[in-house]
């Protein structure tokens, strides 16, 4: 079951998933000037059996200028620099990932992929929050959000995190102990997360839903 809305926005914070539940989809998005190859899948899908999970399909991008070719275009110096940054980040993300049954790791980057990754999360997915550079984390409980199914609808739990002040950035789970507290949080206003929304509003009783597409920005 796909989660219908996006994880909560926390001011001056970004989120990431340490691992992706089976059923998660990742759009095959290409950077400007490139497009998905004609025979290519529109998304990667986290699938698996009892012992192993992996991403089905591979994303491939080709130059929009190229007509009937699937040849990978050599990136220009600017693009190479951008791609290297993405690779480095991906490797860093993989380094702190544990192998969870029924979960896939962060997929490695593909040639000429877009700078934003658009994930479609499923019920049971957990995402973790950290404050952006220059903001300090005030924990009032777990700095995480879980997609749950209740009331016939999906929702994300509220992460117990506030990002404040000018100081060192906080860390992801395992690198800092949050202080637990039962208090709730006020609604957050803005976020550096890039999100695109695709509204599918149904106002009938049993289906008052909104569908959002999730995007996390590479920092």
């Amino acid at each position: 079951e796909l989660c219908d809305d996006d994880p909560p926005k926390i001011t001056h914070a970004t989120f990431k998933a340490v691992a992706y539940k089976e059923g998660t989809m990742l759009n095959c998005e290409c950077k400007r000037g490139f497009r998905r190859i004609k025979s290519g899948s529109p998304y990667m899908l986290c699938t698996g059996n009892s012992s192993h999970s992996s991403w089905d399909n591979q994303c491939q991008c080709t130059s929009s200028a190229a007509r009937n070719t699937t040849k990978q275009v050599t990136p220009q110096p600017e693009e190479q620099k951008e791609r290297k940054t993405t690779e480095m980040q991906s490797q860093m993300q993989l380094a702190d990932q544990v192998s969870l049954p029924g979960h896939c790791r962060e997929p490695p980057p593909w040639e000429n992929e877009a700078t934003e990754r658009i994930y479609h999360f499923v019920v049971g997915q957990t995402v973790y929050y950290q404050c952006v550079q220059g903001y300090r984390a005030l924990h009032r409980g777990p700095a995480e959000s879980v997609c749950k199914m209740t009331h016939g609808k999906t929702r994300w739990t509220q992460p117990q995190l506030i990002c404040t002040g000018e100081t060192e950035p906080s860390q992801f789970p395992g690198e800092e102990e949050p202080q637990a507290s039962p208090d709730g949080l006020p609604e957050s206003e803005t976020s550096r997360l890039v999100t695109t929304t695709d509204f599918r509003i149904q106002t009938e009783v049993a289906a008052t839903m909104e569908t959002f597409i999730f995007t996390t920005e590479y920092q």
Partner: antibody, heavy 120, light 107 residues
Framework: QVQLQQSGPGLVKPSQTLSLTCAVS??????????WNWIRQSPSRGLEWLGR?????????DYAVSVKSRISINLDTSKDQFSLQLNPVTPEDTAVYYC??????????WGQGTLVTVSS | EIVMTQSPATLSVSPGERATLSCRAS??????LAWYQQKPGQAPRLLIY???TRATGIPARFSGSGSGTEFTLTISSLQSEDFAVYFC?????????FGQGTRLEIK
């Protein structure tokens, strides 16, 4: 501390409109992490959920099938109030009516309850 | 709609003893189940949500268990203030439903 304070008449004539209001303090009705509900309780029906209103970038209402054609839940965000209208009513609508907050888990805060008698 | 059935309708237990109340759903409600306590003239009070999580301020003698269609509320050592009516409620479906209640009385 969240509090829900109910108000409204305790006696309504058959075929007329039952109207109750629930004033919220300690929270906002526009809180995206909660839904605002009406529930009633009678010896014959037990506890019966009637409907909810909630905000998810716009306002939504969900109504129980048993009362869908007769119920309306409205909001006054400036006063942090929500209200119940049930029209028309019959003696079978005689019950104690409660408003309650639901943070998408269970009803954690309830109003004090209002006994509404439908009788001519 | 999901029908919630509680048993027994009335349970007689002596103070200090353990009370076990059951709730069955007509179809799976996952762990989306709550328990309430109600005393005469009062609104229901939330005891347990998510099948097994105690609400704020609820004593540790109250515990919930189960998932899917079978659920249990256990009161480990009954206090005089625990004698009341107990309701289960599912919130898995968009249309919320309650059980008919179990009256817990002093034996």
């Amino acid at each position: 501390q969240v509090q829900l304070q109910q108000s409204g008449p305790g006696l309504v004539k058959p075929s007329q409109t039952l109207s109750l209001t629930c004033a919220v303090s300690g929270d906002r009705v526009s809180n995206i992490n909660a839904a605002w509900n009406w529930i009633r309780q009678s010896p014959s029906r037990g506890l019966e959920w009637l409907g909810r209103t909630y905000y998810r970038s716009k306002w939504y209402n969900d109504y129980a099938v048993s009362v869908k054609s007769r119920i309306s839940i409205n909001l006054d965000t400036s006063k942090d109030q929500f209200s119940l209208q049930l029209n028309p009513v019959t003696p079978e609508d005689t019950a104690v009516y409660y408003c309650a907050r639901d943070p998408w888990e269970a009803f954690d805060y309830w109003g004090q309850g209002t006994l509404v008698t439908v009788s001519s | 709609e999901i029908v919630m059935t509680q048993s027994p309708a009335t349970l007689s237990v002596s103070p200090g003893e353990r009370a076990t109340l059951s709730c069955r759903a007509s179809q799976s409600v996952s762990s989306n189940l709550a328990w309430y306590q109600q005393k005469p003239g009062q609104a229901p009070r939330l005891l347990i949500y998510a099948a097994s999580t105690r609400a704020t301020g609820i004593p540790a003698r109250f515990s919930g268990s189960g998932s899917g269609t079978e659920f249990t509320l256990t009161i480990s050592s009954l206090q005089s203030e625990d004698f009341a009516v107990y309701f289960c409620q599912q919130y898995n479906d968009w249309s919320i439903t309650f059980g008919q209640g179990t009256r817990l009385e002093i034996k």
